[in-house]
């Protein structure tokens, strides 16, 4: 018999999360900045 | 909240097109891994699988019946509709659609809701 | 196809009994995708199916905890371990991997 379709046709790939840090001149403050790929 | 209801002519002769529409609210087939199912039970017997049809309009049919059926589906009206063409009084029996979605994101593969259900008679 | 044998078809019980309703597959139904899809609906008298189990073992949400499922490849089991009044009526096995997606018979649990 052939199979019934269990699968939506796409992958979710492990996620990356890339976090980076900057100074902003003079008051010291950091930018935190967030960056979520990898879903296909 | 999800509701499904089918609808149908009630009464048919041999030979004759049944059409059957399930209206649906609560979803949508224009979202990804959501599918309809038709499923039929003659009156004090069990259930037969007949036909799905998922968002991207893949098909897929009972074999023992598939020259007779045709599933499609009206995304935008939220609709799915079964016809199944020459019945005979074999196809006399309650008509039920079902919703069945997959997603690798949450466990929701199985028959969750069901419609009412709408009557045939086959008869001459 | 597959097949669905259900015993047994009748299962005469008195309330706060323990039932148990038992389901053979003619084949494996264990997916190429590690999955097996065994169901339990309950249908009552004028109503459509319910899920009660699905994946052989996972209760649907607002299923009783009185409800359990069990098995593996070809060999199922629906346990209700208490039956109370709202739990009578037909218990159908439902197998999802192979197309033709096949019921059992079903199984009529009902007062002794």
């Known amino acids: 018999d052939a199979e019934f379709r269990h699968d939506s046709g796409y992958e979710v790939h492990h996620q990356k999360l890339v976090f980076f840090a900057e100074d902003v001149g003079s008051n010291k403050g950091a930018i935190i900045g967030l960056m979520v790929g990898g879903v296909v | 909240q999800v509701t499904l209801k089918e609808s149908g002519p009630g009464i048919l002769k041999p030979s004759q097109t049944l059409s059957l529409t399930c209206s649906f609210s609560?979803?949508?087939?224009?979202?990804?891994?959501?599918?309809v199912g038709w499923i039929r039970q003659p009156s004090g017997k069990g259930l037969e699988w007949l036909a799905h049809i998922w968002w991207d309009d893949d098909k897929y049919y009972n074999p023992s019946l598939k020259s007779q059926l045709t599933i499609s589906k009206d995304t935008s009206r939220n609709q799915v509709f079964l016809k199944i063409t020459s019945v005979d009084t074999a196809d006399t029996a309650t008509y039920y659609c079902?919703?069945?979605?997959?997603?690798?994101?949450?466990?929701?593969?199985?028959?969750?809701?069901w419609g009412q259900g709408t009557t045939l008679t086959v008869s001459s | 196809d597959v097949l669905m044998t259900q015993t047994p078809l009748s299962l005469p019980v008195s309330l706060g009994d323990q039932a148990s309703i038992s389901c053979r597959s003619s084949?494996?139904?264990?997916?190429?995708?590690?999955?097996?899809?065994l169901e339990w609906y309950l249908q009552k008298p004028g109503q459509s199916p319910k899920l009660l189990i699905y994946?052989?073992?996972n209760r649907f949400s607002g299923v009783p905890d009185r409800f359990s499922g069990s098995g593996s490849g070809t060999d199922f089991t629906l346990k209700i371990s208490r039956v109370e009044a709202e739990d009578l009526g037909v218990y159908y096995c439902f197998q999802g991997s192979h197309v033709p997606l096949t019921f059992g018979a079903g199984t009529k649990l009902e007062l002794k």
């Open positions: 994946k052989v073992s």
């Open positions: 609560g979803f949508s087939l224009s979202t990804s891994g959501m599918g």
């Open positions: 079902a919703r069945r979605s997959i997603s690798t994101l949450v466990p929701e593969d199985y028959f969750d809701y």
């Open positions: 084949q494996s139904i264990v997916h190429s995708n590690g999955n097996t899809y």
